[in-house]
């Protein structure tokens, strides 16, 4: 299941591999899928202290 290209990009890269607009990279099976198929972590409550967000899997510009 863990096949495909590895990226050497840093923690703050917007996505580890190019996906077409409206697609996001599924880190667990390592391919591009519709962003709506992936569930993001629960949002932090307002004012909660937490490390700065890292790799955000957003659609590619």
């Amino acid at each position: 299941m863990r096949r495909g290209p590895r990226s050497l990009r840093g923690r703050d890269a917007p996505a580890p591999t190019p996906c077409v607009p409206a697609e996001c990279f599924d880190l667990l099976v390592r391919h591009c899928v519709a962003c709506g198929l992936l569930r993001t972590p629960r949002p932090k409550p307002a004012g909660a202290s937490s490390p700065a967000p890292r790799t955000a899997l957003q659609p590619q510009e």
Partner: antibody, heavy 117, light 111 residues
């Protein structure tokens, strides 16, 4: 808020079969990853496998030949079919869903499966 | 499979103590600049509860006395000031490579 409710546990004889159900509410099982995790009495957690948004399944290789995960999207429910059960399969079985990093942030309450003659 | 080894297996501590639990993976669980390492708390008869994901990100609603650190193969869960409700068993988990695997658990008991 995702809620998960397991059912189907109980006593089964060695060599028998059982199907566990996990009914999800608050999100569709056609998105994300939907897991089974088990815990033998007094022991640690063991990942059984998952079914994801596309219906793709992946299993712990030690269990794959006997366990099958499936889903019914119309009921928003996924299942764990367990065959050729052994005493060592006695455990509490949890269903859980994970976010895109694999961390399981919502869990069911667990259902006990006892394999004994 | 990636083997996860937690230490210690159990520990006794008092309310207010600083507690550190370590988890070592048999190979790196980092990929794409992300550590696929998570920490859970479990109390008897209850389902596990996610505390930390991606090595150091605090799950929503989890008290800030919990923190995580590490990368590669070595990770740490720290409770800065142990509270009565923190007596439980803690598990690490990796989701870098299938099959996903858990550590054997660390039981935190009252001294």
């Amino acid at each position: 808020e995702v809620q998960l409710v397991e059912s189907g546990g109980g006593l089964v004889q060695p060599g028998g079969s059982l199907r566990l159900s996990c009914a999800a509410s608050g999100d569709s099982i056609t998105r994300g990853y939907w897991n089974w995790v088990r815990q033998a009495p007094g022991k640690g957690l063991e990942w059984v496998g998952y079914i994801n948004y596309s219906g793709t399944t992946y299993y712990n290789p030690s269990l794959k030949s006997r366990f099958t995960i499936s889903r019914d999207t119309s009921k928003n429910t996924f299942y764990l079919q367990m065959n050729s059960l052994r005493a060592e399969d006695t455990a509490v079985y949890y269903c859980a869903t994970n976010h895109l990093y694999g961390a399981m942030d919502y869990w069911g309450q667990g259902t006990l499966v006892t394999v004994s003659s | 499979d990636i083997q996860m080894t937690q230490s210690p297996s159990s520990l006794s501590a008092s309310v207010g103590d600083r507690v550190t639990i370590t988890c070592r993976a048999s190979e790196s669980v980092d990929d794409y600049g992300i550590s696929f390492m998570h920490w859970y708390q479990q109390k008897p008869g209850k389902a596990p509860k996610l505390l930390i994901y991606r090595a150091s990100d605090l799950e929503s609603g989890v008290p800030s006395r919990f923190s995580g650190s590490g990368s590669g193969t070595d990770f740490t869960l720290t409770i800065s000031s142990l509270q009565p409700e923190d007596f439980a068993t803690y598990y690490c988990q990796q989701t870098s490579k299938d099959p996903w695997t858990f550590g054997q658990g660390t039981k935190v008991e009252i001294k």
